[in-house]
């Protein structure tokens, strides 16, 4: 149930993002973000996930890249880039590891 | 209950390498989950974080210091240590090992802290 | 990088409430934590992720935090609570811990 928060073995990720407590934070898995809203510059946020892992399958758009992954700071130089304005019709999504 | 025990010698000559141990007991430093954490307190001063590291060797430098720190751990001695390279008079404080809590990393046990002096 | 600032000094008379403030771009978005240090001693944790308490530590020490401005309050004061205050978030952009540089509560 992707509403419901794991309850699996805690991962330790790398957090990048201003709501971080400090330099890593535990979940059940890591996550990238990279978002561009309207008009600013592309922002890169690294964290732990523990709700709605089918983010994860999100295929990139031009303006949201979400990226998973299930080891110890894996996500720690992990870089995304964001799909171009007109995306390949059959470009797959990803569930990193 | 957790206790920290910083060691080292008390003074230093400007230039030199000051180095310091903190020993843990009452908690393994491999197993719990958490990282180790040096704080400095120059005298009549404010607290100035040092840096973090975990027992696998992961670390964490105070930007302004980093490329005069190296940290380490020993697990078999339920260790972890600080060096500090080509110290100066400014380097003179309280020198704290810490432990910061699980995910909120808040500093929640603490060594007593000693005074290293820099000098001639 | 992220500055702190906190007023070096606050005074109250005992019984009162002692209000200590953190001021900090947007602290609101961080979590702020509180020390307690009394001459010659190590730091105690006095509040954490805001307005938590540690286990020990009397109901009369609550925190907050919003805006550009985190409060640690003791309600009650008692002459045991002279000390040097510290708060202390984890800044992202320059990947350190940041201190405030104090304040000292005097109990008249």
């Known amino acids: 149930d992707p509403v419901k928060p794991s309850r699996g073995p805690l991962v330790t990720c790398t957090c990048e993002s201003p709501h971080c407590k400090g330099p890593t934070c535990r979940g059940a898995w890591c996550t990238v973000v990279l978002v561009r809203e309207e008009g600013r510059h592309p922002q890169e946020h690294r964290g732990c996930g523990n709700l709605h892992r089918e983010l994860c399958r999100g295929r990139p758009t031009e303006f949201v890249n979400h990226y998973c992954c299930d080891s110890h700071l894996c996500n720690h130089n992990v870089s995304l880039v964001l799909e171009a304005t007109q995306p390949p019709s059959e470009q797959p999504g990803t569930d990193g590891q | 209950q957790v206790q920290l025990q910083e060691s080292g010698p008390g003074l230093v000559k400007p230039s030199q390498t000051l180095s310091l141990t903190c020993t843990v007991s009452?908690?393994?430093?491999?197993?719990?989950?958490?990282?180790w954490s040096w704080i400095r307190q120059h005298p009549g001063k404010g607290l100035e974080w040092i840096g973090y590291?975990?027992?696998?060797?992961?670390?964490y430098y105070n930007p302004s210091l980093k490329s005069r720190i190296t940290m380490s751990v020993d697990t078999s001695k339920n260790q972890f240590s600080l060096k500090l390279s080509s110290v100066t008079a400014a380097d003179t404080a309280v020198y704290y090992c810490?432990?910061?809590?699980?995910?909120?990393?808040?500093?929640?046990?603490w060594g007593q802290g000693t005074l290293v002096t820099v000098s001639s | 990088s992220y500055v702190l600032t906190q007023p070096p000094s606050v005074s109250v008379a005992p019984g009162q409430t002692a209000r200590i403030t953190c001021g900090g771009n947007?602290?609101?978005?961080?979590?702020v934590h509180w020390y307690q240090q009394k001459p010659g001693q190590a730091p105690v944790l006095v509040v954490y992720?805001?307005?938590d308490r540690p286990s020990g530590i009397p109901e009369r020490f609550s925190g907050s935090n919003s805006g550009n401005t985190a409060t640690l309050t003791i309600s009650r004061v008692e002459a045991g609570d002279e000390a040097d205050y510290y708060c202390?978030?984890?800044?992202?952009?320059?990947?350190?811990?940041?201190f405030g540089g104090g304040t000292k509560l005097t109990v008249l």
């Open positions: 810490a432990r910061p809590k699980l995910d909120d990393w808040a500093l929640d046990y």
């Open positions: 009452g908690g393994s430093i491999s197993s719990s989950g958490h990282y």
């Open positions: 947007n602290i609101g978005s961080k979590t």
């Open positions: 992720n805001d307005g």
């Open positions: 590291i975990y027992y696998s060797g992961d670390t």
């Open positions: 202390q978030v984890w800044d992202s952009s320059s990947a350190r811990v940041v």
